[in-house]
């Protein structure tokens, strides 16, 4: 078989179930810095009639807030648009639904325009594994090593996790 | 054993175009992004542009947005780098990069050996 590595196999349903954040990067360092608006950790993800529902986990105010988003699907089959602090262009990069998954966004808001990527788990404990494929996504949409946050289970609300 | 060829530099003046190719062969099972960096003397390699799986989402660099287009025919396992109005600055050998599986589940990065493109009169 050749071809693409364009969705994962079975379709997206394959990435329901729980996740863990690993990594984050971004083209504007205060995004992903604590407290900035895209330094979420991902707790769960289900997929219906081609869009990706997640409940994401927010920290505020020293407690972990479970928030409920949608990304809608577009006629790209790896590209889906999400409102969350403006507009995002959502593009799945890279996923084995039993191991890992690298996602994209071009995120518009206020006339600015961002990139953020984002690195997320099955298993916490082979988080070092997919590193290197993070850094080459992160290389192949134009962010470097020194705008990548990788982190630590204090960072990633473990605490607020059921 | 996966190679990346690349053709198509060469000398070409200011606004001109040149379109160059990178054609991957060897035991490939997927084929994920394909691009070109670029690497001038005495500079650090950049990215030029990105093709993502398909070739429906694409990434570019702010240099080359609206100058350069970058294609792919999966069929041939080759990605294009159409450029036009092409300026001094734009001088460097051009690599391609590819994200390849050779066994599912596998995958690595893959750099071809670099191409010359000059701008000059």
């Known amino acids: 078989q050749e071809g693409n590595h364009e969705e994962p196999q079975g379709g997206l349903e394959e990435l329901s179930g729980r996740w863990h954040s690993v990594a984050l990067a971004s083209n504007k360092s205060d995004l992903i810095k604590p407290w900035g608006h895209f330094r979420v950790f991902i707790h769960s993800m289900s997929a219906k009639d081609g869009n990706l529902h997640g409940d994401i986990l927010i920290p505020q105010d020293g407690q972990c807030e479970k928030v409920s988003l949608t990304a809608f699907k577009t006629a790209t089959s790896n590209k889906f648009d999400l409102e969350y602090w403006g507009h995002n262009d959502l593009y799945l990069a890279e996923v084995d639904p039993k191991s890992y998954l690298i996602l994209y966004m071009i995120n518009q808001y206020n006339d600015d325009t961002s990139l953020v990527a984002h690195l997320m788990v099955r298993d916490l404990s082979r988080q070092q594994d997919f590193l290197p494929a993070f850094e080459s996504v992160c290389e192949d949409i134009g962010l470097h090593k020194d705008q990548i946050v990788v982190l630590s289970d204090d960072d990633r609300c473990q605490g607020s996790r059921d | 054993e996966v190679q990346l060829v690349e053709s198509g530099g060469g000398l070409v003046q200011p606004g001109g175009s040149l379109r160059l190719s990178c054609a991957a062969s060897?035991?490939?099972?997927?084929?994920?992004?394909m691009g070109w960096y670029r690497q001038a003397p005495g500079k650090q390699r950049e990215l030029v542009a990105t093709?993502?799986?398909?070739?429906?989402?694409?990434m570019y660099a702010d240099s080359v947005k609206g100058r350069f287009t970058i294609s792919r025919d999966n069929a041939k396992k080759t990605v294009y780098l159409q450029m036009n109005s092409l300026k001094p600055e734009d001088t460097a050998v051009y690599y391609c990069?590819?994200?390849?599986?050779?066994?599912?589940?596998?995958?690595?990065?893959?750099w071809g050996q670099g191409t010359q493109v000059t701008v000059s009169s």
């Open positions: 990069k590819a994200r390849i599986s050779r066994r599912y589940g596998n995958w690595d990065d893959y």
């Open positions: 060897g035991t490939i099972f997927l084929i994920n992004r």
């Open positions: 093709s993502f799986t398909s070739g429906n989402s694409t």
